[in-house]
């Protein structure tokens, strides 16, 4: 397994609708044609997988139908969007990139993006 550098922003604030977007950029040592991108969440020293997608270079990222993630790719950059976030989902979101083809296999893990989610205040009751 060969190591690869992955860069991602340190901090992102989710929108009031619970949507957070960030760019995951990897330093590809060669011309990879099949790439796997995984988003992991680290909170209280516990790591869980949020979503994952394998894509062929030049094609769209395809996450599972029930995934909370969507994304697009451009060169060595992946634009990731996570939706449906609530305050309890605040945590460190780590981008993992694997170059699956051609050999050799490369694995890169970013330092993580701290996503802050603030639940919107409920609207006050209207008098009319």
């Amino acid at each position: 397994c060969k190591a690869m550098h992955v860069a991602q922003p340190a901090v992102v604030l989710a929108s009031s609708r619970g949507i957070a977007s960030f760019v995951c950029e990897y330093a590809s040592p060669g011309k990879a044609t099949e790439v796997r991108v995984t988003v992991l969440r680290q909170a209280d020293s516990q790591v869980t997988e949020v979503c994952a997608a394998t894509y062929m270079m030049g094609n769209e990222l395809t996450f599972l139908d029930d995934s909370i993630c969507t994304g697009t790719s451009s060169g060595n950059q992946v634009n990731l969007t996570i939706q449906g976030l609530r305050a309890m989902d605040t945590g460190l979101y780590i981008c993992k990139v694997e170059l699956m083809y051609p050999p050799p296999y490369y694995l890169g893990i970013g330092n993580g993006t701290q996503i802050y989610v603030i639940d919107p205040e409920p609207c006050p009751d209207s008098d009319f």
């Epitope: 997988e49 994952a52 993992k96 296999y105």
Partner: nanobody, 119 residues
């Protein structure tokens, strides 16, 4: 823990064929590169063929046109069909699953199966 069990090796004459099988414990094909490596006495372990989750196949130059890698997701098994075998194909063949689990790389090996090509 992933377990890989190879079978199908044996003694075959030059020009003959063999099919190696590698049975995996669980469906690991969706996130692992499955590969066949071989190691002849006194040599290092070399990649012969591999198949990715997306179905991309790689072959070493020495086996192109003679060997075919395939997989059966329903049986959790990966195969290596070896045709037109040569004496220089003699080696121990190992099945490999390579990928990652959460933040850690993973690299699993089978116990190996001997292939001998001799008249």
């Amino acid at each position: 823990e992933v377990q890989l069990v190879e079978s199908g090796g044996g003694l075959v004459q030059p020009g003959g064929s063999l099919r190696l099988s590698c049975a995996a414990s669980g469906n690991i094909f969706t996130r692992n590169i499955m590969g066949w490596y071989r190691q002849a006495p006194g040599n290092q372990r070399d990649l012969v063929a591999s198949i990715t989750p997306g179905g991309n196949m790689y072959y070493a130059d020495s086996v192109k046109g003679r060997f075919t890698i395939s997989r059966d997701g329903a049986k959790n098994t990966v195969y290596l069909q070896m045709n037109s075998l040569k004496p220089e194909d003699t080696a121990v063949y190992y099945c490999n699953a390579r990928g990652s689990i959460l933040l850690d790389p993973s690299n699993y090996w089978g116990q190996g199966t001997q292939v001998t090509v001799s008249s």
